[in-house]
Amino acid sequence: KESCDVQLYIKRQSEHSILAGDPFELECPVKYCANRPHVTWCKLNGTTCVKLEDRQTSWKEEKNISFFILHFEPVLPNDNGSYRCSANFQSNLIESHSTTLYVTDVKSASERPSKDEMASRPWLLY
């Protein structure tokens, strides 16, 4: 899909299994043509996506794409949940698909569940 619109490359229903206490970077790959858009992260709370105001973010620039990164330093248990990035471009709001973080508590890290066990336990999101 080639165009000069801003495009946000987060896969639909993408998932990550991460460990509380570890650092983690959640990337929002952004393609744009001229001016870099203003990008933000939000966390889903039901059907509402709550903007993450006071979180550390940064940009990483590569040849064909840029990454707007949300930093977790460290990951906390309540970071569990679904996140979305959004870009403001020519007065349009472009929203990514949501991506889900499954956080395993460091206390039980020795019995850390597999990615598939995490995926089968949607209650961890609530």
Epitope: K11, R12, T47, H97, S98, D116
Partner: antibody, heavy 119, light 112 residues
């Protein structure tokens, strides 16, 4: 264009492990989801599971009761399926397929491999 | 699991005439992003399935415009405006909204 090539043994012994590989061309698999579907002779389609090759995250059909393992090798641009403790009921054509993870803009199936479970 | 129910399971048609296949899901396929992930596949005899329609009504590239998809929520339809010989085979609906992904039983389109 996107193409898939499955490979693996066509005959597996009961209680053994079925192993198939699916090599992709025309696309970088990290931008996709890859999945496996099977079709017993003369019957319909059954979804086995999928992988996000970018991070290895998998989803399975619970009916396979942890017998299925899907993996991906980004450096080889391929995915694999292993199905353990097979019985005659696992005899089927096994298809791998790939689709665009961002926009669903393509969905391509391999040619399928008939795997027979028999001693 | 979401149960996908197709009807009819066998559809005898006359070449040049229209055909219609129904697909019902046991729960809504409307995703949280506002899109409905309902696909239609065609499987010609001896061949692999290929996607014809995605997101209910979008045709894949190379799919003739005699194929159209419609519907919402739990009720979906695939229509062929004028059946041609190359259209014969089995058609499957399947959902990509919820895990595990599930398929309809298939509808066999055959010559009357």
């Amino acid at each position: 264009q996107v193409q898939l090539q499955e490979s693996g043994p066509g005959l597996v012994k009961p209680s053994g492990t079925l192993s198939l590989t699916c090599a992709a061309s025309g696309v970088n698999i990290k931008d996709t989801y890859m999945y496996w579907v099977r079709q017993p002779p003369g019957k319909g389609l059954e979804w086995i599971g999928r992988i996000d090759p970018a991070n290895g995250y998998t989803r399975y059909n619970p009916s396979f009761k942890s017998r299925a393992t899907i993996s991906a090798d980004k450096s080889k641009n391929q995915a694999s399926l292993k199905l353990s403790s097979v019985t005659a009921a696992d005899t089927a054509v096994y298809y791998c397929a790939v689709y665009d993870g961002y926009y669903e803009s393509f969905d391509v199936w391999g040619q399928g491999t008939l795997v027979t479970v028999s001693s | 699991d979401v149960v996908m129910t197709q009807s009819p399971l066998s559809l005898p048609v006359t070449l040049g005439q229209p055909a219609s296949i129904s697909c019902r899901s046991s729960q809504s396929l409307l995703d949280s992003d506002g899109k409905t992930y309902l696909n239609w596949l065609q499987q010609r005899p001896g061949q692999s399935p290929r996607r014809l329609i995605y997101l209910v009504s979008k045709r894949d590239s190379g799919v003739p415009d005699r194929f159209s998809g419609s519907g919402s929520g739990t009720d979906f339809t695939l229509k062929i405006s004028r059946v041609e010989a190359e259209d014969l085979g089995v058609y499957y609906c399947w959902q990509g909204t919820l895990f595990p992904r599930t398929f309809g039983q298939g509808t066999k389109l055959e010559i009357k």
